[in-house]
């Protein structure tokens, strides 16, 4: 959901006019302006669809366009996982599947897409209104939600079009670690910046059409981007939008197996939509982390020597080696 | 190093209940979901279903879920199988077993089992 | 659910022989997040409880003899003992590790003559 902001093109000086080491010293800003570009804005889509054979059987689909490594997925229905919503399969990398009824066959399609297949009968069978929701821990990112319903008019075999991010939901996780340095580096290439335009300026390629100039606006940042710069360092994206179907491919497109969503243009945020918390104190990562698995029913993955998986009576010694074998 | 401690028999009359235990140790109880599983004389393994010791959440294989009910009691750190309504056909060694974290349903650590005769 | 077929049920061999046991399953094993197999290997030795030999379809468990070799990917994967030793008479029993509910085969019956 990445919107492109028109900002002047930087262009590059000529070689030769601030010698190598100027080539190089301008080649980091271009690489961190991407970092910072591309860091902040996954998304995740969700579509569903009612199989025309079996009335009561939904398959769920499910995938998560970012860059970080996925650690955990959790496919719910109802609502949100943590809001009433109840998990019907948990999808970790490593481990394998866990499922839970009316699921009946839950996998991985890529290293970023799962599906599900629900099938039920009597009470625990789904319903055509049913709300079903994806949530994806990743690391650094941190853990992104969306849901997706079928549209009340669906016919059977018909699917509702993926449903790009109705609800984005980026915990703590995702302000720490690797986004820690990206946030350095943004603020580093800031200060590149400013020092850029307070020297003299070199001489410039003349030309607004030049090569460079289409090539440097690929690398611009979008408005959020940018805004996300000026925030405070702890920030938490918590924004919520609405379910935008009409973003997606319609469904005169290519077949729902093969869709996926466009990545609608959303109204930038401003800082104003961005909420500030304080900084965690060191260590609570790893509880920001273990509390995506505990939503789930999970045990988070190997956190390292000495870190209990989930709190324990007997204090943080009770937990050492890979099942806290003393 | 991991134990887990389970009564040699039970002799339970049909339609009666019967509650199994397994006493764990050797490791903390709470990190990791205790499996049960069913071995018919002669016969393969069946696994009944899961339970988490953290937050006693459940997950049944469809064929068990009117038959057995998981719980757990932190402070023995022991976990129970109640079976209901025994017949003949449930007539069988009953296993727990726990993992040691590296994928939800390989069985790393094995109790010695139970052994359930159905007999009036 | 996920059907898990062994065969043979049962077979005799000689110490020292080269032992292979199949298992196939009725839908792939293998994850694409990370192509990793999820099927487990089993030992049961008479009147003991199982003892799990391989996971990961090759990976093999701590303290396990390294003459017990598991191999295969997606739906067929097989059990070698490389050279059979009188210890290893035992029951065999493949099982996915994939999704709930775990299945396991109907097992191998291995004698040593």
């Known amino acids: 959901m990445r919107t492109e902001a028109q900002v002047p093109a930087l262009q590059p000086p000529e070689p030769g006019l601030e010698g190598a080491m100027g080539h190089r010293t301008l080649v980091l800003p271009w690489v961190l302006l991407t970092l910072c570009v591309t860091a902040g804005t996954p998304e995740v889509w969700v579509q569903v669809r009612m199989e025309a054979t079996e009335l009561s059987s939904f398959t769920i689909r499910c995938g998560f366009l970012g860059s970080g490594s996925i650690s955990l997925v959790t496919v719910s229905w109802g609502g949100p996982n943590g809001a009433g919503g109840t998990t019907l399969a948990v999808l970790h990398p490593e481990r394998g599947i866990r499922q839970w009824a009316p699921a009946r066959q839950a996998r991985w399609e890529t290293q970023s897409s799962i599906s599900l297949i629900l099938e039920g009968s009597g009470a625990s069978s789904p319903c055509a209104n049913t709300t079903f929701c994806c949530k994806f821990a990743s690391f650094p990112e941190g853990s992104w939600e969306a849901c997706g319903s079928l549209p009340p008019s669906s016919d059977p075999g018909l699917s509702a079009p993926p449903t790009p991010a109705p609800i984005l939901r980026a915990d703590l996780a995702g302000i720490l670690g690797v986004s820690g340095v990206l946030l350095f580096g943004c603020v580093y290439l800031l200060h590149l910046l400013r020092r850029h335009k307070h020297r003299p300026a070199p001489r410039l390629q003349p030309s607004r059409t030049s090569p460079q100039a289409p090539r440097a606006r690929a690398w611009a940042p979008s408005q959020a981007s940018q805004a996300a710069l000026h925030v405070p360092y702890a920030t938490i994206n918590t924004s919520c939008r609405p379910a935008t179907l009409d973003t997606a491919h319609p469904h005169g497109g290519p077949s729902w197996w093969a869709s996926l969503p466009t990545h609608a243009a959303h109204r930038p945020q401003g800082p104003a939509a961005w909420a500030s918390t304080p900084i965690p104190a060191r260590g609570s990562f790893v509880s920001v982390e273990n509390g995506l698995y505990a939503q789930a029913g999970e045990r988070p993955p190997h956190t390292g020597p000495g870190l209990t998986l989930f709190p324990d009576p007997r204090g943080p010694r009770a937990m050492e080696g890979p099942l806290g074998v003393r | 190093q991991v134990q887990l401690q389970q009564p040699g028999a039970e002799l339970v009359k049909p339609g009666a209940s019967v509650k199994l235990s397994c006493k764990a140790s050797?490791?903390?109880?709470?990190?990791?979901?205790m499996h049960w599983v069913k071995q018919r004389p002669g016969q393969g393994l069946e696994w009944i279903g899961e339970?988490?010791?953290?937050?006693?959440?459940?997950n049944y294989n469809e064929k068990f879920k009117s038959k057995a009910t998981l719980t757990v009691d932190h402070s023995s750190s022991t976990a129970y199988m109640q079976l209901s309504s025994l017949t003949s056909e449930d007539s069988a060694v009953y296993y727990c077993?726990?993992?040691?974290?590296?994928?939800?349903?390989?069985?790393?650590?094995w109790g010695q089992g139970t052994s359930v005769t159905v007999s009036s | 659910d996920i059907v898990m077929t062994q065969s043979p049920s049962s077979l005799a061999m000689s110490v020292g022989q080269k032992v292979t046991m199949s298992c196939k399953s009725s839908q792939s094993l293998l994850n694409s997040f990370n192509q990793r197999n999820f099927l487990a290997w089993y030992q049961q030795k008479p009147g003991q409880s199982p003892k799990l030999l391989v996971y990961?379809?090759?990976t093999r468990d701590s303290g396990v003899p390294d003459r017990f070799i598991g191999s295969g990917s997606g739906t067929d994967f097989t059990l070698t003992i490389s050279s059979v030793q009188a210890e290893d008479l035992a029951d065999y029993f493949c099982q996915q590790h994939y999704s709930t509910p775990p299945t396991f085969g109907g097992g191998t019956k291995l004698e040593i003559k």
């Open positions: 050797g490791y903390t109880f709470t990190s990791s979901w």
């Open positions: 077993a726990s993992n040691a974290d590296r994928a939800y349903y390989t069985m790393d650590y």
């Open positions: 990961f379809a090759s």
């Open positions: 339970i988490n010791p953290s937050d006693g959440r459940t």
